[in-house]
Interface confidence: medium
């Protein structure tokens, strides 16, 4: 369990940099995370909205906090979901 946990952690932390990348090859991963963020109402992988770097401007309403039931915080003057997606992804992987 702890070994697979560590591998998942390392993989997610490694892939965080893909969110701020601008190449076509990273786009698929970014779009998968966007879907995940929408579904679980979280933002980014490790550091929240900051993980998206300049892409935060390219995907409008990327992490927009629209759900009153979830904690929000301000980022670059925008209300975004406070929770990062890493724990949701780990839970999701554990259940599947």
């Amino acid at each position: 369990k702890s070994k697979s946990d560590r591998i998942v952690n390392e993989t997610l932390y490694e892939n965080t940099k893909l969110l701020s990348a601008t190449g076509e090859s990273e786009k698929q991963f970014q779009e998968a995370i966007i879907v995940f963020q929408e579904e679980f109402k979280c933002c980014g992988l490790v550091n929240g909205a900051a993980d998206w770097g300049n892409n935060f401007q390219h995907y409008p309403e990327l992490c927009a906090c629209l759900d009153k039931q979830r904690p929000c915080q301000s980022y670059n003057g925008k209300q975004v979901y406070k929770e990062t997606c890493i724990s949701f992804i780990k839970d999701f992987l554990a259940k599947n």
Partner: antibody
Framework: EVQLLESGGGLVQPGGSLRLSCAAS????????MSWVRQAPGKGLEWVSG????????YYADSVKGRFTISRDNSKNTLYLQMNSLRAEDTAVYYC?????????WGQGTLVTVSS | QSVLTQPPSASGTPGQRVTISCTGS????????VSWYQQLPGTAPKLLIY???HRPSGVPDRFSGSKSGTSASLAISGLRSEDEADYYC???????????FGGGTKLTV
């Protein structure tokens, strides 16, 4: 150039149904949340519904909840609004707008008239 | 009854400065950005101000927006006859999980 073109409006009897479409072009449709806003004759703007880029979240005004359904087809760059159990008070020009927390582009609107 | 409150009308003469107010609550203006829309007679609305005070490209700097607490305002300086239109403020409302508009202000020049 961003373009939004609504269609599907018309005259319908109370209790009837109508499906509005909004064809989008000039931007990457799948990156953007989209919304519907309406305006009754001589009245102000009223937000109707919004949908996130990948349809993961949908939001509705209380006045249409349970009767209207928003959807999108990213492969066709098209936004939809399925309107059921229509009432006289749903009579309005329906605008399709880009985004959900700022409406930065609007279509020209399509008129829906609910009358017997 | 609109969630955001605007005066129904405002007026001014060419060259004058006019201000339109928009009052909301902590769940809308108090916690989210305000946008302003201009609707010229017989046309679709157009984004005039976003994120409280930013102008989209193409909007003259005669238009400016500001926000303080749960209120926002739109100022138009150097009024022109072509500014005659309906102006609406709007913001996302966290309590309603929906977007809310003001009732609109009809500006007469």
């Amino acid at each position: 150039e961003v373009q939004l073109l609504e269609s599907g409006g018309g005259l319908v009897q109370p209790g009837g149904s109508l499906r509005l479409s909004c064809a989008a072009s000039g931007f990457t449709f799948s990156n953007y949340a989209m919304s519907w806003v309406r305006q009754a004759p001589g009245k102000g703007l009223e937000w109707v519904s919004g949908i996130s880029p990948n349809s993961g979240n949908k939001y509705y005004a209380d006045s249409v909840k349970g009767r209207f359904t928003i959807s999108r087809d990213n492969s066709k760059n098209t936004l939809y609004l399925q309107m059921n159990s229509l009432r006289a008070e749903d009579t309005a020009v329906y605008y399709c707008a880009r985004r959900s927390t700022i409406f930065d582009y609007w279509g020209q609107g399509t008129l829906v008239t609910v009358s017997s | 009854q609109s969630v955001l409150t605007q005066p129904p009308s405002a007026s001014g003469t060419p060259g004058q400065r006019v201000t339109i107010s928009c009052t909301g609550s902590s769940s809308n203006i108090g916690s989210n950005d305000v946008s302003w829309y201009q609707q010229l007679p017989g046309t679709a609305p157009k984004l005039l101000i976003y994120d409280n005070s930013h102008r989209p490209s193409g909007v003259p700097d005669r238009f400016s927006g500001s926000k303080s607490g749960t209120s926002a305002s739109l100022a138009i300086s150097g009024l022109r006859s072509e500014d005659e239109a309906d102006y609406y403020c709007g913001a996302w409302d966290a309590s309603l999980s929906g977007y809310v508009f003001g009732g609109g202000t009809k500006l007469t020049v």
